[in-house]
Every structure is written in structure tokens, then in C-alpha cells.
């Protein structure tokens, strides 16, 4: 028998520095977790103790903090090189700055293979990107070889900016011939490493003949065997065992997100490359693991540029940006409008001639808007200003919801109106009218939404049975502020870009902004 140790990360999302337990900015260092310096300590400890170790990443290193905003992926290549990753799969967020924003900072700088079998380049891009990412790679590990085959969510064109010259094929269809090719090369130990979410990971384990292990990402799935060490609730045991269609037991793993855990899986293979046993658990990277001093010193060196960036002007406002709780928790506020407009603008994807865009709606809990911005400071808006407005380090995500769920959400928005509670919704691409004289749960008297399948966008009444795409904060997607109906009833959830980054990009693009209060939210019968 031959034993392989797979160390894995996924959805790190720019958390190069240690973070608080909830993966936001580290405040009390003695309670902080993750970060590449701490990750390196643990990886090195395992490399020294065990003979056959692979360090893999399942995508979405890009996007999530000011590190990515400033360094645009150069930081990913630099620190992944320093940690000596063996391979990475492309995630959807690796395309956030377009194909060039992937090629230049990452593909050309990585000292490790970057993989995806289901992304096919066409047209002029085909020759330009040839060899920079691969469908699979065979790696020597000790005296054996291991094949690693990559995959990426086929929803990427709706979630990011891969352009028109990359085709995202069905994962299973694309993976099978590559695995078959590895078999003909006498590679009998094959890991599928990819970024399509836990449901697809399980399908790959079930359907793709010859895949021995699946290491996934995208869904931020936390798996654990035994008592979990932090706040995350396991979605299943680690590894999650899938019985393949040809009768094999295939371990499937994922390691939550944000570099909080290091996935640790030990696999025992027989001489024919069959998995005999698999066991392990994600390792919580808490403060009991010291940060590696040389990586930490490097992080501190790279940090200097971030501090300079946060005080530079992004753009100007010529109006007061009202982000006060007195406004945003009670009525339409222009800060809410600005943020929602930025959220929609960030999700412009012309992927179908029938649609002017794939999504037109935004909702945003008023309680998530934490500060106004005064225009009397020469109109200057900085990253620092925006960090006061959106201090929680969240993301603006894409969900699919039924009209009936949206109706419930808007009822919840005003179910206890008047108490300055955070669930009051700010909107974009939605016109809502409330009648507060009616009983809670029956206060939405009009709810019109902006069409997407139209050449001239206009507002139509919400249809209860129709499925709509909506952009919203991850906080709401996860049921925050009492929006349990969103969490329970959402049909799809894809995590998006860092909230501050979305707004800062929009302001930089617009240069001068002047958001108004324009009747998106109204109150009827003189009740307000």
C-alpha cells in the first residue's frame, strides 16, 4: 500500500493576512485565524513529518479584500509560490479582471500548474493562452505519480468576466476523456480538483470513471468528522464518501473558505491505484499555530502599498451620501441606491441576445449601511470612506429566488417598521409600495420588478411562480437579519465580489456621482 497526504484549500478569497473567527479583519491578534504565514507553518510541519504530500488549491484565490483590489492577483502568485503549491484549479473569480487579469498576474507568474479541463479557448485567445493553463498535470510524488485533473463552474460567464473566447463545457463531459487519457499514460491515481460546488463534486465522484478523489470548492462547504472546532456547522463527514456508478467508494472533500482551515486528507492506495482507505479532517488554523516569521515579514512588506491605497481618491460625490441609520432603516436612502446601482453594474453580463442583462434586481439590508459620506470634503471618496460604510467585509452575491420568496422578504422588511431595525430593504431594479396601516405580513401593496428579457427595461408586476435572479449581500443570502426565507428557499447561490470593491470600482468608473432618492420605495395611504 502507498499513502498520499492531500493538503487543500479553496475559496481563500484574498485572505492573505490572518482574520477574525468570522473571516473579517483581524482585530484581536491572539484570537485570529488563517492567513498565509500560519498556513505555511502547518504545511511545512506536515511536509517534514510525512513522505508523500501534495498541496492543492481548488480555486477562487482572487477577490475578497483590498489585497486583490490593489495587487490584482500578483499577491496570489507570489504567496502561492512561496507556499509551494503543487497545483491549482481555476475558480470563477479568477476571471473577475478578465482573461488578461488572469494571464498576466497569475498564469505567467505561477510556479505551479493551473488546471481546468472544461474551459476551452477559441478564436485569437486559443494561441495566446495555450499552455498557460492545462486540463491535467501528472506530478511525481515520492516513487509514484499522481494525475490531477481540473474543472471550473460552467456558470462562470454569469458570475465573472471570462469574455467571449472561453467556452465553459459541462464538467463531467469534459473530465471523462482527460481521465481516460491519464489512464492510457498508466497513471492510476487520479485527483479531480475543481471549483463547481459540492453538488457537482459529488456528481463527478459518481459519474467520472477513474477519478479516485475529488477536491472541491465554490460552495464553501465545511465537512468534519467528530466535534467541529469552531463555528462552522458540518454539511457532512470528512471525507464525504460517494459510491460511484462503477461501485467504488470515492472520497469528496472541501475545506470551507477564507483560509480558515487547511484540508487534510490521507489516502491509502493499493498497487493498482485503488483507494483502500481515506481519513482526515480540516485543520483549524487558529492562534495555537504560529505564523511563519519569514512569510509574515513578506506580508508586512507587501502591506505598505495597501495602507497608501486606502487614502487615495477613487472618485467624487457632488451630493451628500446619506448612509445614516435614521434614513436607511426607515426609507429609501441615496447611499442604498448608490450601492445597489453599483451591485447591478458589477453584474452586467451580455451573455444572451434576448436579455439586456441576466439580472436586474438588487436588495440590501439598510442595517448593513453603517455610515454616510459628506460631500463637503471636496467631494472626495476614498477606500477608507467606503470601509466605514461597508465595514463587515462581505460579498455581493447572486441568488435565484421565486417571486413568492421575494414577496416574503419585502413583508419581512417592514414587519416591525419604525424600530430602526436593520432588515428594512434598500433596492435597485425594484419599485415597492408599503401600506403600514395593514397588519405585518400583508403590508406590500405593490411590487414591480425591472424586466431582463427585454430590449427596453421597464417595470412589471412581480410573478409569484417566476424564478428571478437577485444581487444581495451574502449576509442576506445566509438568512441574516431574519431573512430566513431567503436562506431556506433560494434555488441557487453563487458568491460574488467584495462589497467595498464593487462600490469602489463603480465610483472609479463613474468618476463623479450624484445618487438621488427617486421613488424606488414608497408608502401609501398617508401612513408615512
Amino acid at each position: 500500500a502507498w499513502e498520499l497526504t492531500i493538503l487543500h484549500t479553496n475559496d481563500v478569497h484574498s485572505r492573505l493576512e490572518q482574520t477574525s473567527e468570522d473571516s473579517s479583519k483581524c482585530v484581536n491578534a491572539s484570537r485570529c485565524m488563517g492567513g498565509v504565514a500560519r498556513l505555511f507553518t502547518k504545511v511545512q510541519q506536515i511536509r517534514r513529518a510525512e513522505p508523500n504530500v501534495l498541496l492543492l488549491d481548488a480555486g477562487d484565490q482572487y477577490q475578497g479584500t483590498i489585497w486583490f483590489t490593489v495587487y490584482k492577483g500578483a499577491e496570489v502568485a507570489h504567496f502561492m509560490n512561496a507556499l509551494r503549491y503543487d497545483a491549482m484549479a481555476l475558480g470563477n473569480h479568477e476571471f473577475d479582471n478578465g482573461v488578461e487579469g488572469l494571464i498576466e498576474p497569475l498564469l505567467k507568474e505561477a510556479k505551479f500548474p493551473i488546471l481546468s479541463a472544461n474551459i476551452k479557448a477559441k478564436g485569437p485567445l486559443a494561441s495566446q493562452i495555450s499552455g498557460l493553463y492545462l486540463p491535467y498535470k501528472v506530478l511525481p510524488v515520492g516513487d509514484e505519480v499522481v494525475g490531477i485533473v481540473g474543472y471550473t463552474s460552467k456558470e462562470t460567464p454569469f458570475l465573472s468576466n471570462p469574455g467571449t473566447n472561453l467556452v465553459f463545457e459541462d464538467e463531467i463531459t469534459a473530465l471523462q476523456p482527460e481521465v481516460d487519457k491519464l489512464k492510457t499514460l498508466n497513471v492510476n491515481k487520479i485527483i479531480a480538483l475543481g471549483h463547481s460546488g459540492f453538488e457537482m463534486d459529488k456528481l463527478i465522484a459518481q459519474k467520472v470513471r477513474g477519478v479516485d478523489v475529488v477536491v472541491g470548492g465554490h460552495s464553501n462547504t465545511f465537512l468534519y468528522t467528530g466535534n467541529p472546532p469552531s463555528k462552522e456547522v458540518p454539511a457532512g463527514k470528512y471525507p464525504f464518501i460517494v459510491t460511484s456508478d462503477d461501485g467504488r467508494k470515492v472520497p469528496v472533500v472541501q475545506a470551507y473558505a477564507f483560509g480558515k482551515y487547511l484540508g487534510y486528507l490521507k489516502i491509502e492506495f493499493d498497487e493498482r491505484g485503488n483507494v483502500i482507505s481515506s481519513h482526515g479532517n480540516p485543520i483549524l488554523l487558529n492562534s495555537s499555530i504560529p505564523e511563519d516569521p519569514s512569510i509574515k515579514a513578506d506580508i508586512n512588506k507587501w502591506r505598505i502599498k495597501l495602507d497608501n491605497y486606502s487614502t487615495q481618491e477613487l472618485g467624487k460625490t457632488i451630493v451628500y451620501l446619506d448612509g445614516s441609520s435614521q434614513s436607511c432603516r426607515f426609507r429609501e436612502c441615496n447611499m442604498g441606491n448608490l450601492i445597489c446601482d453599483a451591485m447591478i453594474n458589477n453584474n452586467l453580463r451580455h451573455t444572451d441576445e434576448m436579455f439586456w442583462n441576466h439580472v436586474s434586481m438588487c436588495i440590501l439590508n439598510g442595517g448593513g449601511i453603517r455610515s454616510p459620506i459628506d460631500e463637503r470634503n471636496n467631494g472626495t471618496i476614498t477606500w477608507e470612506n467606503l470601509a466605514a460604510v461597508l465595514p463587515f467585509g462581505g460579498t455581493f452575491d447572486l441568488v435565484q429566488l421565486k417571486g413568492s420568496t421575494l414577496k416574503k422578504a419585502f413583508e419581512h422588511s417592514v414587519h416591525r417598521y419604525g424600530q430602526s431595525t436593520g432588515e428594512f430593504l434598500q433596492v435597485g431594479g425594484i419599485h415597492v409600495v408599503y401600506d403600514l396601516s395593514r397588519k405585518p405580513g400583508d403590508r406590500v401593496v405593490k411590487l414591480d420588478v425591472l424586466c431582463t428579457k427585454c430590449r427596453v427595461p421597464s417595470y412589471d408586476p412581480l410573478k409569484m411562480d417566476e424564478v428571478y435572479k437577485v444581487i444581495l449581500p451574502n449576509f442576506l443570502a445566509n438568512g441574516g437579519d431574519g431573512f430566513q426565507m431567503i436562506k431556506d428557499e433560494l434555488l441557487r447561490h453563487d458568491s460574488g465580489d467584495q462589497d467595498i470593491n464593487v462600490v469602489s470600482t463603480y465610483i472609479s468608473k463613474m468618476k463623479v456621482i450624484y445618487p438621488a432618492v427617486e421613488g424606488r420605495i414608497k408608502f401609501s395611504t398617508g401612513s408615512h
Partner: antibody, heavy 117, light 107 residues
């Protein structure tokens, strides 16, 4: 397949400058960095520097900063190494090599530079 | 700069023999080590990258190993065409630096 075409030899007078060329084929020129390496007769190899053809960004060995200048012409898909104020110490074979995963994977045949009056 | 020291500087070996060259870095180079073969009057040919990964088309009798500061290249069964000079290169840190080379000759 990947090939890097370099002229066989150049003879230049001391004090002059020379521009050595490297024309790759078999891959997209701007998609990979290009290394330059010096080898004096009967000696080992010395790394001069590297250039990113898509944006002209360079990294140099400090020992060659005042001697060598790396450039590219994307219209002809050619990389160049310019050497100035030549002395007999600069007589050597100069190789270009494509960078992949950080290291040089494919090498040119080398240009033999002779500095002689 | 990182100094790369190769040993021995030259060696004789018989056909079919197992041959090992070593390369020592002045500091940890994180396995970012290359091995090249150079024949007289020819350009270097890359054999191994990342300390132990064989380039496509390189015969399987070549293998690399090592980590930290110490690395080695092994030819499991020497063939006539293997004679030449073998160089190591670290690409962990700029400037990249080469070892002085090991000259391999057939007995």
C-alpha cells in the same frame, strides 16, 4: 514545436554596442517571459535577466544592470539583448530561453559574441 | 545572491552505472531547482524542474530529489549519450543563479 532562433555569431569592436536577437516560434510570443543567459568560453552560466514581452517589464541581475538592456518588438515577435561599452569580458555565448513555471524550459542555440579590435 | 555549489566538479562513470550529482544552495530554495544537461558546443537542455519533475520527452532514467538546501540528480543506468556537463539552477529568488556544473565523462 517550440524553437528559439538566434544568429550564430557577432563580431564587434571594443567600446561599441551590439543588439542580439531571439525569435521564437511554436508558441504565442507575449504569453511567456524570456530569460537571457551568458556563458563565457569554458565557464559556467550566468543569468542576465528576463523580460515580459506583453508589457516590457524586466528583472535584471544587478551585475548586468549597467551592461545589458532587454527589449522586445511584439510586431515581429522578437526579443533583444543590447550590450553596451563592450570589452573582451563580454565575449561569450548568449542564450535566450523561454520561461515556464518560473524556469527556462526551451533554449535558443545561442549567439557567440566576439569582442575584438 | 544565492550561491549554488555543485559536486563533484567532474566525474567518470561506466555505462550502465548509477550516477548521482549533488547541488547545495546557500539557503532554502523551496524546491525551485532545475537541472540541465549541456553537450559541447550545444545549448543547455532542461531535464528537471521543481527538484523532481521530469520535462516531457526526458528519459525516465533521470530523476531528481531534494528539498531545502540539498538536491541531487540521479541517472539510474548511464548511457553513452548522457555524457556532458550538468548544471543546477535555483529559480526561487532573483537573481536566478547556476551551479558551477559537473562534467560527466564515460570511463
Amino acid at each position: 514545436q517550440v524553437q528559439l532562433q538566434q544568429p550564430g555569431a557577432e563580431v564587434v569592436k571594443p567600446g561599441a554596442s551590439v543588439r542580439l536577437s531571439c525569435k521564437p516560434s511554436g508558441y504565442f510570443f507575449t504569453s511567456y517571459w524570456m530569460h537571457w543567459v551568458k556563458q563565457r568560453p569554458g565557464q559556467g552560466l550566468e543569468w542576465i535577466g528576463e523580460i515580459n514581452p506583453s508589457n516590457g517589464r524586466t528583472n535584471y541581475n544587478e551585475n548586468f544592470k549597467s551592461k545589458a538592456t532587454l527589449t522586445v518588438d511584439t510586431s515581429s515577435s522578437t526579443a533583444y539583448l543590447q550590450l553596451s561599452s563592450l570589452t573582451s569580458e563580454d565575449s561569450a555565448v548568449y542564450y535566450c530561453a523561454r520561461r515556464n513555471y518560473g524556469y527556462p524550459d526551451y533554449w535558443g542555440q545561442g549567439t557567440t559574441l566576439t569582442v575584438s579590435s | 545572491d544565492i550561491k549554488m555549489t555543485q559536486s563533484p566538479s567532474s566525474m567518470y562513470a561506466s555505462l550502465g552505472e548509477r550516477v548521482t550529482f549533488t547541488c547545495k544552495a546557500s539557503q532554502d530554495i523551496n524546491t525551485y531547482l532545475n537541472w540541465f544537461q549541456q553537450k559541447p558546443g550545444k545549448s543547455p537542455k532542461t531535464l528537471i524542474y521543481r527538484a523532481n519533475r521530469l520535462l516531457d520527452g526526458v528519459p525516465s532514467r533521470f530523476s531528481g530529489s531534494g528539498s531545502g538546501q540539498d538536491y541531487s540528480l540521479t541517472i539510474s543506468s548511464l548511457e553513452y549519450e548522457d555524457m556532458g556537463i550538468y548544471y543546477c539552477l535555483q529559480y526561487d529568488e532573483i537573481p536566478y543563479t547556476f551551479g558551477g556544473g559537473t562534467k560527466l565523462e564515460i570511463k
